[in-house]
Amino acid sequence: AGVFELQIHSFGPGPGPGAPRSPCSARLPCRLFFRVCLKPGLSEEAAESPCALGAALSARGPVYTEQPGAPAPDLPLPDGLLQVPFRDAWPGTFSFIIETWREELGDQIGGPAWSLLARVAGRRRLAAGGPWARDIQRAGAWELRFSYRARCEPPAVGTACTRLCRPRSAPSRCGPGLRPCAPLEDECEAPLVCRAGCSPEHGFCEQPGECRCLEGWTGPLCTVPVSTSSCLSPRGPSSATTGCLVPGPGPCDGNPCANGGSCSETPRSFECTCPRGFYGLRCEVSGVTCADGPCFNGGLCVGGADPDSAYICHCPPGFQGSNCEKRVDRCSLQPCRNGGLCLDLGHALRCRCRAGFAGPRCEHDLDDCAGRACANGGTCVEGGGAHRCSCALGFGGRDCRERADPCAARPCAHGGRCYAHFSGLVCACAPGYMGARCEFPVHPDGASALPAAPPGLRPGDPQRYL
C-alpha cells in the first residue's frame, strides 16, 4: 500500500507564439482545479477508461480575474498535493492523465459551470520510495509543470511497496534470513505470512494468507508439479500415477473478482478486469466516491457512497462521458445561418456572423444600401452581405463616380477600332468583318455569317453597340 503524490508547480502559457487567452475575465471570474487519473502499465487507453490505480481531485484554486490587456500569466493554483492512495503493490510502470479544469463563477444559472481547459497524458516508469520526478507537459498553447512520486505507507517498503517492515525485536540484529529495512535501519523486513503449508520453494504470496504458485507448479499449496506431457485437461491437481493434470479447481473458479469484475486466468494466477470505479487485485477498491464530486457540469452522482461501491454520473442534457466532462457537439447541427461560425459555450450557443449579417443566428441581412447612394444614376444592389452599385452607361467604380472608358477592354474583335460614344461604344470593323463587335466574318461571295443584315447597313459599316 502507498500513495502517489502529485505537486502542480505552474499552469500557464507555453513558450513560443500564439499565447492563449486568459480563461478568466472581469465579467467571468474563474478558478482552476486539477484531476489526476492513474492506470497501471504503459497502456495508451482512452481518457474515459477506468482509472484503475486511482484518481484524485484537487481543491479549488484562488479566484482569478484577468487584468484587461495583460497577457495570460501563470494562473493561481490550488494549495497542497493531489494524493492517490493505492491499496496493492505499486506497478512500477504507470500511465497518467492530468486535467486542468476551469470553474466559472459568473452568473451561471444552476450554479458554477465547469469546462476542461487542458488534458495532458504520459507513460512513465517510477519506483516507489524514490525522489520527486519533475515533468513538463504541453497541451495546445498551455504548459503544465509538475512533480510526482510514489511512497509506501508503513509498514510497506520497497520499490513496489510489497515488503513489510516491523520494529526490531532485538536491538542489534534482525532474525534469521531477514534484512534490515532500508532506509529504516532500525526496523527489520517482516516475512509475509502465506497460507499455512504453502510450498516455500514453489509458492509465494503478495497478500497474507494466499498461496500463489510459480510456473510449473499447481495445487492449493503449490506442491503439485505440472506435467509437460500430453494431457487431456489443462489444469490439476496431478494424478499420482501419470503426473498429468486432471480437472480440478482453477484460479477463476468461484470468480474471485468482486464488484462485477471479470476473471481471466494467467500463467501464474488470475487477473481481474474491473468495472469503472474499482481497482485492486480483486476489484475490491474504489478510488473515487461521490464525496469527491467526480461528476462535472451539474451531473448527478449516484452510488459510490463508500470506497467499495461504484459511482455513476447521470449527466444533464448536452453533456456526456463517465464524468459528464464532455459536451455534446451541438454545433454539428449548424444552427448559424449565412455562413456564421458556431461556438458552443455550454450554457448557450453563439454565432459569429460574417460581414453583412447580424442577429443571434446571423439571420438578419444588414441593409447595406441604407444611406448609401450610387452616383450618376447608378442603383444599389444588395447581395451576400455586401453592397454594390449597378452603374449607368458610361460610369464605373464602386460608387459609379468614375467615368468609364468603354474601349478599355478592347471589345472590338478582329482588329476593329473602338470609338467611345455617348451611348456606349462603336466598333469600326476591319475589311472582311462585321457585327456590333466585328465578330462575324464576311464570306468571299458577299454573304455574311449573319442570317440577314439589318436594313440600311452594309458590311463594313461601323456598328453601334447600344
Epitope: R330, Q334, P335, C336, E363
Partner: nanobody, 119 residues
C-alpha cells in the same frame, strides 16, 4: 418551454428499415435547426442528420445514402427514415432542436427512442 417527443424506435433485423418521428410542441416558438443525434451504448452522442439553420439537410458520413431526413412544417414534425440498418446503428436516438422563443434561442432535447438492430 418546447417539448420534443420521439417515437418509432424498436427492434429490427440487419438490412431492415424504421421511421422515427419527432414532434415539437409548445407555444409561440419557431424552429431554427432540428435534427437527430444518436448515442450507442457506452459511446458518445453524435449528430446523425438534420436541417441546419439555413434549412439545408446535413448527414453524418456513416449514414449517407441509407438515412433520409424530412419534415412537415405544418405539424412541426421531423422524420428520420432509416434503411439498410446495421448492428452499429443500435443506439438511443434523440431529437434535438435550436428553437426561437420570443427573441431568444434555446436548445432542447427529446427523451430519446431506442433502436436495436440484431439478427
Amino acid at each position: 418551454e418546447v417539448q420534443l417527443v420521439e417515437s418509432g424506435g424498436g427492434e429490427v433485423q440487419p438490412g431492415g428499415s424504421l421511421r422515427l418521428s419527432c414532434a415539437a410542441s409548445g407555444s409561440d416558438f419557431s424552429i431554427n435547426a432540428i435534427g437527430w443525434y444518436r448515442q450507442p451504448p457506452g459511446k458518445q452522442r453524435d449528430m446523425v442528420a438534420g436541417f441546419t439553420g439555413d434549412g439545408v439537410t446535413t448527414y453524418a458520413e456513416s449514414v449517407k445514402g441509407r438515412f433520409t431526413i424530412s419534415r412537415d412544417n405544418a405539424k412541426n414534425t421531423v422524420y428520420l427514415q432509416m434503411s439498410s440498418l446495421r448492428a452499429e446503428d443500435t443506439a438511443v436516438y434523440y431529437c434535438a432542436a435550436d428553437v426561437k422563443i420570443g427573441g431568444d434561442y434555446e436548445w432542447f432535447w427529446g427523451q430519446g427512442t431506442l433502436v436495436t438492430v440484431k439478427p
